[in-house]
Amino acid sequence: EVEKTACPSGKKAREIDESLIFYKKWELEACVDAALLATQMDRVNAIPFTYEQLDVLKHKLDELYPQGYPESVIQHLGYLFLKMSPEDIRKWNVTSLETLKALLEVNKGHEMSPQVATLIDRFVKGRGQLDKDTLDTLTAFYPGYLCSLSPEELSSVPPSSIWAVRPQDLDTCDPRQLDVLYPKARLAFQNMNGSEYFVKIQSFLGGAPTEDLKALSQQNVSMDLATFMKLRTDAVLPLTVAEVQKLLGPHVEGLKAEERHRPVRDWILRQRQDDLDTLGLGLQGGIPNGYLVLDLSMQEALS
């Protein structure tokens, strides 16, 4: 707590200006009116205050707004935002995307802090869903944002927002997240023609089921190996050699380099060696000729 002392004669701040960096902490406390500070928050960012001075300014705002700051103040917090705790932020009601952008700008270039995570959470909950503009903004600042959400949280993303997602935004997503996002992407891009559709859906294919992969194999899409390696193993296993060949097109040669890695390894184990040989890649490990393949999962289902 800063001691309550009288403001020295002639030092009462008439405006928030650059002279305040020369005030001691107790002078700021005594000479800066909290209401003046609140109305001139936009000036604070232009003035190189010390961290200790920022603490005093925050304290003044906390006293003025014990229930949480109004958005008119929040929007102009600037680097004072870095002084806020998640507990402070939970008191806020942030509804404007401009306010969100202004605060994310302050943290730009840094990892997502607990403050930022709380701010985003408050904002998204206030909106009820992750709309396209919000998603656009969040992924612009934090490309990995989408993949930081749980499958449950992702379920609130409307298909229309998927248009804002860039391939790099999905780099760190796991299969569970892609399982949720893929159907939304399929719906969002459904009216596009074949080649354009594939370009858009490609990043989401880690959540695609077998039947969709089979359908894609009929469309000359020439999927690259990097995308193929991210497909769900359980979706790849039922594909035939012919389907994989059509799916990959000229990239099929890349299977040889990946034959020890999932899902290629597991897929090879399910194919007849005769079929694999037709690719001419020297892939080994398929089912030898004359062997009978029993689908035990089907048998269990019948019993």
Partner: antibody
Framework: QVQLKESGPGLVAPSQSLSITCTVS????????ISWVRQPPGKGLEWLGV???????NYNSALKSRLSISKDNSKSQVFLKMNSLQTDDTARFYC??????????????WGQGTSVTVSS | DVVMTQTPLSLPVSLGDQASISCRSS???????????LHWYLQKPGQSPKLLIY???NRFSGVPDRFSGSGSGTDFTLKISRVETEDLGVYFC?????????FGSGTKLEIK
């Protein structure tokens, strides 16, 4: 372009007061602070005081009791008033712009100065 | 108040030589915000002072790169790598970390 121009009386009698006006153009006094600096003949620079964008002031400790700086933003003018002048107050008086943003409180533009002689 | 001590008071140099001026402050010029508000000005004969270097080492617009500033805390240096005729005059260091602001006493750069 940025310009500062001082205007003063030239000659002041001992014990009288001095008033100098600094008229600026090319920028706003609501965005920049103004410092006053003086230089006795053949000597160094002495900082007198500053008026900040919000109207607050700081002064040279030794001269504080004799100095007063004010301004009129709408007229783009800054005023220096100095009381009880003595002969050793004879000097050239400069106003200079304090750029607290990009240049961090350096005085980036100066007036040409006005010469003040204290003599009876 | 912060006292700024400049050395030497006079610096005779030959054209093309390097010149070095020292400025020492009576207390640290590092502000609590991490910035060091130490500046250098040049006053040519019959002219107003002009800003050369701000915040220790940043050249003001139009200042040739033969001028460089360095230092930290309480010790600062202005260097001119190859002195030219137009560089002659009095150099002042100044601090705006603490109010009141203060100037050094000046160093006169003259031809040997």
């Amino acid at each position: 372009q940025v310009q500062l121009k001082e205007s003063g009386p030239g000659l002041v009698a001992p014990s009288q007061s001095l008033s100098i006006t600094c008229t600026v153009s090319g920028f706003s006094l609501s965005s920049y602070a103004i410092s006053w600096v003086r230089q006795p003949p053949g000597k160094g620079l002495e900082w007198l005081g500053v008026i900040w964008t919000g109207g607050g002031t700081n002064y040279n400790s030794a001269l504080k009791s004799r100095l007063s700086i004010s301004k009129d933003n709408s007229k783009s003018q800054v005023f220096l008033k100095m009381n009880s002048l003595q002969t050793d107050d004879t000097a050239r008086f400069y106003c200079a712009r304090n750029n607290y943003g990009r240049l961090d409180y350096a005085m980036d533009y100066w007036g040409q100065g006005t010469s003040v002689t204290v003599s009876s | 108040d912060v006292v700024m001590t400049q050395t030497p008071l006079s610096l005779p140099v030959s054209l093309g030589d390097q010149a070095s001026i020292s400025c020492r402050s009576s207390q640290s010029l590092v502000h609590g915000n991490g910035n060091t508000y130490l500046h250098w000005y040049l006053q040519k004969p019959g002219q107003s002072p002009k800003l050369l270097i701000y915040k220790v080492s940043n050249r003001f617009s139009g200042v040739p790169d033969r001028f460089s500033g360095s230092g930290s805390g309480t010790d600062f240096t202005l260097k001119i790598s190859r002195v030219e005729t137009e560089d002659l005059g009095v150099y002042f260091c100044s601090q705006s970390t603490h109010v009141p602001f203060t100037f050094g006493s000046g160093t006169k750069l003259e031809i040997k």
